[in-house]
Interface confidence: low
Amino acid sequence: ELCDDDPPEIPHATFKAMAYKEGTMLNCECKRGFRRIKSGSLYMLCTGNSSHSSWDNQCQCTSSATRNTTKQVTPQPEEQKERKTTEMQSPMQPVDQASLPGHCREPPPWENEATERIYHFVVGQMVYYQCVQGYRALHRGPAESVCKMTHGKTRWTQPQLICTGEMETSQFPGEEKPQASPEGRPESETSCLVTTTDFQIQTEMAATMETSIFTTEYQ
């Protein structure tokens, strides 16, 4: 069952995504003028076990005008490794996905991919929020939202964040100010789709293999 709703909207804030739990799917979409190769995969799938996760399948796009030339960047399926660092994570800092067993990293871009990445992800994805440039954060609790399954229904928890103007962008502890924070783009017509910038992080927590859809814009 999909997450029924989009993540909550916080005025003057964007959310970020870092890691994708096993079972997450990423549609193989091509930009205008290109299409998937005939035998190409419809999606990439994050698979594996608790110690090793990677994206199965590869997205490949070819020009719609030609039949025999396949232009592609083959992203290597990204192996999930134990984090080789002693750095302590502060409680509010999003955990780098390399330290999360059973999760895949964001796949590298592939040639001629669409401007929007459409993810189908499992319940339990966590989304972190931060204020856009020009606003500062007033935290009243975790600046995050999790898609949870409760009594057979899905819901997003409410992030405890208010963004107030006239100050510089608030960051997560240990995270630096981005050069630009594009405002959210128009939402898709489909209610389960959220169109946001790829300025996002996502970390996952629950184990339910229910999927939801999450889109990420790419240039």
Partner: nanobody, 122 residues
């Protein structure tokens, strides 16, 4: 203030080599995945190569076995060793940084440089 400053571009002959550098400042470089991307005039961005904070490296097929990406966290610098250059490598090369993911353009990177021009011509 966050800065990514690319250098090392220039004119090279086909088959020649160049080494690009990207000096980072204003953020914790070692915590970020960093990438090289390129843009040919009038066209979109093409992701070239990237390296995660733990050292994992990835390459586009078009540069695999010719380009080598590396990072020096002590110097807050990203490198791209470009060997066996081809005319089609001619482009403006950018470095970008993003937390936990490889990125390919000013829209998808958290931080983005100004670029350095590479021209491969005889």
């Amino acid at each position: 203030q966050v800065q990514l400053v690319e250098s090392g571009g220039g004119l090279a002959q086909p088959g020649g080599s160049l080494r690009l550098s990207c000096a980072a400042s204003g953020f914790t470089f070692s915590n970020f995945a960093v990438s090289w991307a390129r843009q040919v005039a009038g066209e979109g961005f093409e992701w070239v190569s990237g390296v995660y904070s733990d050292g994992d490296t990835y390459y586009a097929d078009s540069v695999k076995d010719r380009f080598i990406i590396s990072r020096d966290n002590a110097k807050n610098t990203l490198y791209l060793q470009m060997n066996s250059l081809k005319p089609e490598d001619t482009a403006l090369y950018y470095c970008g940084a993003a937390r936990g993911r490889l990125c390919s353009s000013i829209m998808t990177c958290d931080y983005w440089g100004q670029g350095t021009q590479v021209t491969v011509s005889s």
